[in-house]
């Protein structure tokens, strides 16, 4: 058993049929010695008396808010949550496996630049009685500070018969050094509580591996005289790290016909313009990637050829 | 050229060669992003290779103030990786494929380090400790980890030379 926060405790249980469970001793936080009784949740049934209460925690029915009273007065509370371990593996019932980039990916994180700011998100089908708490650091043995905000519900989607909820959190490294080469990964830890079930999820990454620039901005076409060619120009996204002479991007320019089956013409360039042939009903798209480190491409920015 | 004492390197040549190094490092291990090395408990390897750190003066401001600190740091790292790529981790069994870019990568590391320190000029003699002997089954993972770290190292070096070529060239 360990303390998650004041008056909230997590009991770690090996979860299998007829498991013995864990013996837990609760102590009433009071100077009083006599006349103390214990109840669980809203029930008025007295579970025991005295300053301490010893319970055998085996299942969710044994978890909940234990309260000690004297007379009609509440003295203190202890909320017990359960953390299940099945076949040596901690349960992951609360969050959905996103399966990208690999199985058992519950947390996904992205950064728009090298400033040390990043966003993580996760999915669940649970809509109520759900709380999250997020902590982060750079390195684990001698951790350096990363500050995370509160997790918020950022999207709701319908997937077949189910509703899916996306939560996200923004974090910022306290003393980020955008130009340095990271040697210690960022660690992100999410505590999830659904009713009386506790679970924790972790992710470990270098900012450089989760970079995904915003799409190029101000995408414009300029027809070239007496030609089917156009000059496409664009600018670095506002959110990308500066100076651009140091934090450089490379770009992919694509000409795509109306039909998905039509051949795509692609040009790669380090410049912020390119000359391409504009076919009727086609569109021109541009996306960006770090020039020197192959992290994710941005989403496409597009304009129609006409 | 980055001669100890302070004259400038051939920024544009360094930019071109460092960008080539980035390409080679990724082509030597293109699928690197799909394997989570931290699951392999690779702290020792990542701790054992060079890193361009915050105080090394490789940020735009540091380069403007005095690029020599950063260039020396990059030079040290290039020599270090060149020695690793020339060791039995890469030359031993299992043999690399004949068209593997590792050979080119090795030569380019040497080429860039020589651009930074031409004959007759010396920062300090580069020493690296004796390498632990490795067995074929260990080498595949070590190669993977070294290339993964090298990709991050040369990315920073390439940014430095690109910025230098754009803003510090005579």
């Amino acid at each position: 058993i360990w303390e998650l926060k004041k008056d909230v405790y997590v009991v770690e249980l090996d979860w299998y049929p007829d498991a013995p469970g864990e013996m837990v001793v609760l102590t009433c936080d009071t100077p009083e010695e006599d006349g103390i009784t214990w109840t669980l949740d809203q029930s008025s049934e007295v579970l025991g008396s005295g300053k301490t209460l010893t319970i055998q925690v085996k299942e969710f029915g044994d978890a909940g808010q234990y309260t000690c009273h004297k007379g009609g007065e509440v003295l203190s509370h202890s909320l017990l949550l359960l953390h299940k371990k099945e076949d040596g593996i901690w349960s992951t019932d609360i969050l959905k496996d996103q399966k990208e980039p690999k199985n058992k990916t519950f947390l996904r994180c992205e950064a728009k630049n090298y400033s040390g700011r990043f966003t993580c998100w996760w999915l669940t089908t649970i809509s109520t009685d759900l709380t999250f708490s997020v902590k982060s650091s750079r390195g684990s043995s001698d951790p350096q500070g990363v500050t995370c905000g509160a997790a918020t519900l950022s999207a709701e989607r319908v997937r077949g018969d189910n509703k899916e909820y996306e939560y996200s959190v923004e974090c910022q490294e306290d003393s980020a050094c955008p130009a340095a080469e990271e040697s210690l990964p960022i660690e992100v830890m999410v505590d999830a509580v659904h009713k009386l079930k506790y679970e924790n999820y972790t992710s470990s990454f270098f900012i450089r591996d989760i970079i995904k620039p915003d799409p190029p901005k101000n995408l414009q076409l300029k027809p070239l005289k007496n030609s089917r060619q156009v000059e496409v120009s664009w600018e670095y996204p506002d959110t990308w790290s500066t100076p651009h002479s140091y934090f450089s991007l490379t770009f992919c320019v694509q000409v795509q016909g109306k039909s998905k089956r039509e051949k795509k013409d692609r040009v790669f360039t380090d410049k912020t313009s390119a000359t391409v042939i504009c076919r009727k009903n086609a569109s021109i798209s541009v996306r960006a990637q770090d020039r020197y480190y192959s992290s994710s491409w941005s989403e496409w920015a597009s304009v129609p050829c006409s | 050229r980055a001669v100890p004492g302070g004259s400038s390197p051939a920024w544009t040549q360094c930019q071109q060669l460092s960008q080539k190094l980035c390409t080679l490092a990724w082509s030597a291990h293109p699928l690197v992003g799909h394997m989570d090395l931290r699951e392999e408990g690779d702290e020792e390897t990542t701790n054992d290779v060079p890193h361009i750190q915050c105080g090394d003066g490789c940020d735009p401001q540091g380069l403007r103030d005095n690029s020599q600190f950063c260039l020396q740091r990059i030079h040290q790292g290039l020599i270090f990786y060149e020695k690793l790529l020339g060791s039995d981790i890469f030359t031993g069994e299992p043999s690399l494929l004949p068209d593997s870019p590792v050979g080119q990568l090795h030569a380019s590391l040497l080429g860039l380090s020589q651009l930074l320190q031409p004959e007759g000029h010396h920062w300090e003699t580069q020493q690296i400790p004796s390498l632990s002997p490795s067995q074929p089954w260990q080498r595949l993972l070590l190669r993977f980890k070294i290339l993964r770290s090298l990709q991050a190292f040369v990315a920073v070096a390439a940014r430095v030379f690109a910025h230098g070529a754009a803003t510090l060239s005579p």
Epitope: - | N47, V49, I128
Partner: antibody, heavy 120, light 113 residues
Framework: QVQLQESGPGLVKPSETLSLTCTVS????????VHWIRQPPGKGLEWIGV???????DYNPSLKSRVTISRDTSKNQFSLKLSSVTAADTAVYYC??????????????WGQGTLVTVSS | DIVMTQTPLSLPVTPGEPASISCKPS????????????LAWYLQKPGQSPQLLIY???TRQSGVPDRFSGSGSGTDFTLKISRVEAEDVGVYYC?????????FGQGTKLEIK
């Protein structure tokens, strides 16, 4: 917890072969190299040799012609053999481990040592 | 072989006073690529096996009191004890693991005055 324990005869006759065993527990021998070090009575420490995680060995050049280090992974045991011993080989013999990495590490855990006396 | 020269060989100290031991290898133990010095410090208490105090010249092993500190780089290293306690008596050794064969200093015997 991590343990290394040396064992073997405490007395060996001159010109014979000294044989010691180091039994380890609490760590994976595929992640650690195991070294032998000795200390003559009242003197300093001398590195004898190492067996690497991959099974290859390196020895101190001053002892190389007489030393063999091997291991039995199924038993989590390492052995040291030192042939043609003389009184100068009388020492406390230690085994110690270092974490496998690109470069050899420092010894973080040692056995308690076993005294071997060479005498007729 | 890298020769490790330790001084002094004997060090009598009054409890509560500081102590300092020097170790000078015959060649540099600094790998400038990764900025590590391949040097460790050990304490061998009477009748015991050596125990690790400091690795990579300046990193304290977990569980080692913070009165022990290591410093130096290249060919000049120092182990300092800020305030010697009775339990610190024993022989202190430096070890280089930069090149084969590993070599130790001759040892410094710290005793209480």
């Amino acid at each position: 917890q991590v343990q290394l324990q040396e064992s073997g005869p405490g007395l060996v006759k001159p010109s014979e072969t000294l044989s010691l065993t180091c039994t380890v527990s609490g760590f994976s021998i595929s992640s650690y190299n195991v070294h032998w070090i000795r200390q003559p009575p009242g003197k300093g420490l001398e590195w004898i040799g190492v067996i690497w995680t991959g099974g290859s060995t390196d020895y101190n050049p001053s002892l190389k012609s007489r030393v063999t280090i091997s291991r039995d992974t199924s038993k989590n045991q390492f052995s040291l053999k030192l042939s043609s011993v003389t009184a100068a080989d009388t020492a406390v013999y230690y085994c110690a481990r270092d974490k496998y990495g690109l470069f050899p590490g420092y010894f973080d855990y040692w056995g308690q040592g076993t005294l071997v006396t060479v005498s007729s | 072989d890298i020769v490790m020269t330790q001084t002094p060989l004997s060090l009598p100290v009054t409890p509560g006073e500081p102590a300092s031991i020097s170790c000078k290898p015959s060649q540099s133990l600094l790998s400038s690529g990764n900025r590590k010095n391949y040097l460790a410090w050990y304490l061998q208490k009477p009748g015991q096996s050596p125990q690790l105090l400091i690795y990579y010249a300046s990193t304290r092993q977990s569980g080692v009191p913070d009165r022990f500190s290591g410093s130096g780089s290249g060919t000049d290293f120092t182990l300092k004890i800020s305030r010697v306690e009775a339990e610190d008596v024993g022989v202190y050794y430096c070890l280089q693991h930069f090149n084969y064969p590993w070599t130790f200093g001759q040892g410094t015997k710290l005793e209480i005055k």
